[in-house]
C-alpha cells in the first residue's frame, strides 16, 4: 500500500493533515492552519483504545452479575473492562456477554479438561479399564480396581460406568 498524503497518526480533513488523538482521548476540534488538534481525556467510565478522531469515547463493558458475570480486569481510559464468569460458569460466546453453568460429564464419561471461565468442560468416554459412575464436572475416568493386587479375583466385570467387583479366590483343597 503506497503512502498516503498524511503521515502515520494523522488524518486528512479539508485538505490538511491533523494529528489523531492518542488512546484514552477523544476529538474536540480538528486542527486548523493555526491550531493543533484538540483532544480531551475520556471520562472514568469510558475508553478509546486506538489513535483516533472519535468525538465520543466508548462506554466500558458492564459485567452484569445477573448474567453470571464478574470483572476480571477493570477498564482504563485506554482499555475496555474484561468480564469473566463466576465460579461454576463459563462464557456462552467469545464476546462473553452471558454465562452458563459448566457441563457435567455423565456416567460412562470422565472429565478430559476442566472448565474455565471461558471454556466448557470437555468430556471423554471412559476407555476399557476405566469407569465413571457419577455425573461430575471434575471427576476423571477412574481405573478399575485391580483385584489381583488385593489377592482377589474378579467376580463381576467392570463397565465404563461400574467398577469391577472383586471377591475371594475359590480355595480348592
Amino acid at each position: 500500500e503506497p503512502p498516503t498524503a498524511c503521515r502515520e497518526k494523522q488524518y486528512l480533513i479539508n485538505s490538511q493533515c491533523c494529528s489523531l488523538c492518542q488512546p484514552g482521548q477523544k476529538l474536540v476540534s480538528d486542527c486548523t492552519e493555526f491550531t493543533e488538534t484538540e483532544c480531551l481525556p475520556c471520562s472514568e467510565s469510558e475508553f478509546l483504545d486506538t489513535w483516533n478522531r472519535e468525538t465520543r469515547c466508548h462506554q466500558h463493558k458492564y459485567c452484569d452479575p445477573n448474567l453470571g458475570l464478574r470483572v476480571q480486569q477493570k477498564g482504563t481510559s485506554e482499555t475496555d473492562t474484561i468480564c469473566t464468569c463466576e465460579e461454576g460458569l463459563h462464557c456462552m460466546s467469545e464476546s462473553c456477554e452471558s454465562c452458563v453453568p459448566h457441563r457435567s460429564c455423565l456416567p460412562g464419561f470422565g472429565v478430559k479438561q476442566i472448565a474455565t471461565g471461558v471454556s466448557d468442560t470437555i468430556c471423554e468416554p471412559c476407555p476399557v479399564g476405566f469407569f465413571s459412575n457419577v455425573s461430575s464436572a471434575f471427576e476423571k475416568c477412574r481405573p478399575w480396581t485391580s483385584c489381583e493386587t488385593k489377592d482377589l479375583v474378579v467376580q463381576q466385570a467392570g463397565t465404563n460406568k461400574t467398577d469391577v467387583v472383586c471377591g475371594p479366590q475359590d480355595r480348592q483343597r
Partner: antibody, heavy 116, light 107 residues
Amino acid sequence: QVQLQQSGAELVRPGTSVKVSCKASGYAFSDYLIEWAKQRPGQGLEWIGVINPGSGGSNYNEKIKDRATLTADKSSSTAYMQLSSLTSEDSAVYFCARGGGGFTYWGQGTLVTVSA
Amino acid sequence: EIQLTQTTSSLSASLGDRVTISCRASQDISNYLNWYQQKPDGTIKLLLNFASRLHSGVPSRFSGSGSGTDFFLTISNLEQDDIATYFCQQGSTLPWTFGGGTKLEIK
C-alpha cells in the same frame, strides 16, 4: 504573498502523456498539501489527487488513479502532475492549489488540449 | 462519493442586492464545506472555509452558513466585481467533490 505559478498550455497527441508543473512561493512548501483539480470546458471541477510535498505521500481519485502521478520537488518548491494514456476526455484546464482548510490558494490553470 | 448539488445554475441580480446561493450535500459533512469564486478569466479564489470562516483578504460582504447537509453563501450589497461563478466543495471525505457551480450575472 502566496503564489502558485503553473506551466504553460500544452497541445498533445492522444495516447501520449503530459506533465504539468506548479511552482510555489511565499510560504514553506513542505508544510502544506498540494491539491490538483480538472475543469473541462464549461463544466464544474473534478478532484484529481493530493500530495504531501514533505513526505511525498499522496491520495488519488479512483477514477483517474491508474493514469495520474503526483510528485513534488522540495528543492525547487515545485509540484508536478503527470497524466498518461491521454484521450479527448482529458482536454481540460488543470489547476493546482495549496491545501490548509480547503483549496486556499490556486494556480492560474494550465490548458491541456488532446488532439490528433 | 458525496454529491454536492447547487440547484441554481445561474442567477441574475441587481447591484446592491443581497444574494444567497445554496449547496446541498448528499450526506452529513459537518462544517467541512468551502466556497470558491471563479472569475470569467478563469482565476479561482477561496472565499470561505469550514462553512462560515472568511478567508483572508475576502470582503466582509461575503458570509457563509449551514452545517450537516445544507449550506448557504450570502453576498450582501452586490458589486460589479462579484460577477463570477461560485462553487461549493466538501472536504469531509475523499474524494473531495465540487458542486456544479452557480453563475451570477447582473440584471
